[in-house]
Interface confidence: low
């Protein structure tokens, strides 16, 4: 640890005196003290001499000697008082900035330790301190205001009693800053606005912060609007509110509105869009195709997006047929609001039955009128197949009827032996029927096709199979000729019942 000579904690001298402070350490040493005039510094290896031959009140302060090379960071200090009868205070800083709840040191150093008993801290012009100000005094350091509050941001003077009169220091401005977590919080209401020309509208931009020092403005497109600001303070936050009231909107009021607030921490902004329309509107749309195909037994959700202003006065889902007069159960209809002017309406159709194919219409009404959006729902079925033996124009013919949706295509197979289903090893011949005759093809119903296979003579130890398939599945029917006639065989696995 370095050693200071003279080896006293405090030194009291008169103005104009010569002061020599010597510091000796094991290695090189450094002096640190208040910035003041007239000091000269002389260093010689492990010692350093700080001296002045004309001490002034401004030399009052604590001088510390440190040894930079010392791993323990030891230091020694001496406090110098230059007792000037005309200058009881040496003010080291005229502005002190702290955050709320920190201790604020007002660095007015007493130049004469004898005056300590008569010191006080006042606000400028001799005003008393604010109530609840908790402070302490150190002749070496000055006055400390403990746990400073924002409201204590004032100009202070240190007062000393000299010969029965109070002598003030120059003023020290204390700035107590709020601990600001970030830019002001913002709200812009509404998030979106639509009005018919001539209607009234209101847009409210509000910002809040723990500190009053922030700015807020509302701009339309890129023009800052001159709106009177309402200020408030509640829940320990300052609030600034800008309210734009438009009695009769016109097209020039439309566009983008931005609420912008800024403070020392930065800027926040939020925007909304204001649409001005000539008249009421009601638009229905769907992201889905209006023509839907679903496999029987599966489920489907029909979704309609509604954009409307003014709001809807009524809406419902309707089944338009053709199978029955049943109507969708209300519990299966669901409405969700995306925002003020956009809504999504969903109709859930679980485990679809054949009788539920057909047209579903969503109807909605507002002052702009009625609108409807209709979905066409067709059910998909795997093919059902049947084969019969008949004579057409005197020729023996196998007649295969296949029914399903989408329209099934048909393939005939002839294979050796008697079997429920031909396998590759047994196949003797294959005939594709690219154009089977369509027997029935009504909307929302299965398509029934018919394929004819003319057979001159039925081979008795063989099987004739009609296979039909579509995108949903396949079906087949095996025809086995027997001497007593013909035996038809649907495959065991084909037990589909819709």
């Amino acid at each position: 640890i370095p050693v200071i000579e003279p080896s006293v904690p405090e030194l009291v001298v008169k103005p104009g005196a010569t002061v020599t402070l010597r510091c000796v350490g094991n290695g090189s040493v450094e002096w640190d003290g208040p910035p003041s005039p007239h000091w000269t510094l002389y260093s010689d290896g492990s010692s350093s001499i700080l001296s002045t031959n004309n001490a002034t009140f401004q030399n009052t302060g604590t001088y510390r000697c440190t040894e930079p090379g010392d791993p323990l960071g030891g230091s020694a200090a001496i406090h110098l008082y230059v007792k000037d009868p005309a200058r009881p205070w040496n003010v080291l800083a005229q502005e002190v900035v702290v955050f709320e709840d920190q201790d604020a040191l007002l660095p007015c150093l007493l130049t004469d330790p004898v005056l300590e008993a008569g010191v006080s801290l006042v606000r400028v012009r001799g005003r008393p301190l604010m109530r609840h100000t908790n402070y302490s005094f150190s002749p070496w350091h000055g006055f400390t205001i403990h746990r400073a509050k924002f409201i204590q941001s004032q100009d202070y003077q240190c007062s000393a009693l000299m010969g029965g009169r109070k002598v003030m220091s120059i003023s020290i401005r204390l700035k107590v800053q709020k601990v600001i977590p970030g830019p002001p919080a913002l709200t812009l209401v509404p998030a979106e606005l639509v009005r018919i020309r001539g209607e009234a509208a209101q847009i409210v931009c509000s910002a809040s912060s723990v500190d009053v020092n922030f700015d807020v403005f509302l701009q339309h497109n890129n023009t800052k609007l001159a709106i009177p600001q309402q200020s408030d303070f509640h829940n320990n936050r300052y609030q600034k509110v800008l309210t734009l009231n438009l009695d009769q909107v016109d097209f020039q009021h439309a566009g983008n509105y931005s609420c912008v607030a800024s403070n020392v921490q930065g800027k926040h902004s939020t925007s909304m869009f204001f649409r001005v329309v000539e008249s009421a509107y009601l638009n229905l749309s769907s992201e889905q195709n209006l023509i839907q195909e679903v496999t029987v037994g599966e489920g489907l959700n029909l979704k309609v997006m509604v954009e409307a202003y003014p709001g809807l006065q009524g809406f419902n889902w309707t089944y338009l047929g053709p199978f029955s007069d049943h109507q969708p159960e209300p519990k299966l209809a669901n409405a969700t609001t995306k925002d003020t002017y956009r809504h999504t309406f969903t109709l859930s159709l679980p485990r679809l039955k054949p009788s539920e194919a057909g047209r579903y219409s969503f109807l909605a009404r507002n002052p702009g009128g009625w609108r409807a959006l209709t979905f066409e729902l067709t059910l998909r079925y795997p093919p059902e197949v049947s084969v019969i033996w008949t004579f057409i124009n005197g020729s023996g013919t196998l007649l295969c009827a296949a029914s399903g949706y989408p329209q099934p295509n048909v393939t005939w197979l002839q294979c050796s032996g008697h079997t429920d289903r031909c396998d590759e090893a047994q196949v003797l011949q294959v005939w594709d029927d690219p154009y089977p005759e369509v027997l029935s093809q009504e909307p929302f119903h299965k398509v029934t096709v018919q394929s004819l296979l003319t057979v001159e003579t039925l081979e008795h130890n063989q099987t004739y199979e009609c296979r039909a398939h579509n995108s949903v599945g396949s079906g087949s029917w095996a025809f086995i000729p027997i001497s007593a006639g013909a035996h038809t065989h649907p495959p065991d696995e084909f037990l589909f019942t819709p």
Partner: antibody
């Protein structure tokens, strides 16, 4: 006699600048805290800002509407107070008064704005 | 900033009437309040300083009272030369004027 005389008012366009002066006499100007106060047409008195004496740090304070646009300075050697007004707005149109806020004369200290100039008119208009 | 709310904004009274004007501060300002008289075309005049002290040369019919947040200015017997606008002003933290009270004679 304690006296304040303002000058420098006039007509200026929005966004323009103007510098007002206030010549002081009859008291120790260097010890005084000086303020500017204005009165817009049909409105009340509004404090603009102040400058403290050099012995009290010579610091300045401003009212919110003018902060960042107006600058108060002093030349103690000329016993003169100044108000530099930049980025002027139409709402800055007013009669501007220079006034003492706190000053010493003959060993007695006076608090309150008891010395006022006659006022100088500033008109901001396009 | 400290706000000063002055009321009424205007009043009409007869010569010899007692006139009272109130001023309310948005926070405690101790007694750091002045009252001024302002006549058209003239510079304002300090009447009362530190809430209740009468400025030298001001007639004794003018008086002030109050401390903290509520202050009162009184003209005990209104005279024709008292027609003016009166302002309160705080100097506890920066300076703020009240909105003014215009006094007229009936």
């Amino acid at each position: 006699e304690v006296q304040l005389v303002e000058s420098g008012g006039g007509l200026v366009k929005p966004g323009g600048s103007l510098r007002l002066s206030c010549a002081a006499s009859g008291f120790t100007f260097s010890n005084a805290w000086m303020s500017w106060v204005r009165q817009a047409p049909g409105k009340g008195l509004e404090w603009v800002g102040r400058i403290k004496s050099k012995t009290d740090g010579g610091t300045t304070d401003y009212a919110a509407p003018v902060k960042g646009r107006f600058t108060i300075s002093r030349d103690d050697s000329k016993n003169t107070l100044y108000l530099q007004m930049n980025s002027l707005k139409t709402e800055d149109t007013a009669v501007y008064y220079c006034t003492t806020e706190y000053y010493g004369s003959g060993g007695v200290w006076y608090y309150g704005m008891d010395v006022w100039g006659q006022g100088t008119t500033v008109t901001v208009s396009s | 900033d400290i706000q000063m709310t002055q009321s009424p904004s205007s009043l009409s009274a007869s010569v010899g009437d007692r006139v009272t004007i109130t001023c309310q501060a948005s926070q405690d300002i101790s007694n750091y309040l002045n009252w001024y008289q302002h006549k058209p075309g003239k510079a304002p005049k300090l009447l009362i300083y530190d809430a209740s002290n009468l400025e030298t040369g001001v007639p004794s019919r003018f008086s002030g009272s109050g401390s903290g947040t509520d202050f009162t200015f009184t003209i005990s017997s209104l005279q024709p030369e008292d027609i003016a606008t009166y302002y309160c002003q705080q100097y506890d933290n920066l300076l703020t004027f009240g909105g003014g009270t215009k006094v007229e004679i009936k």
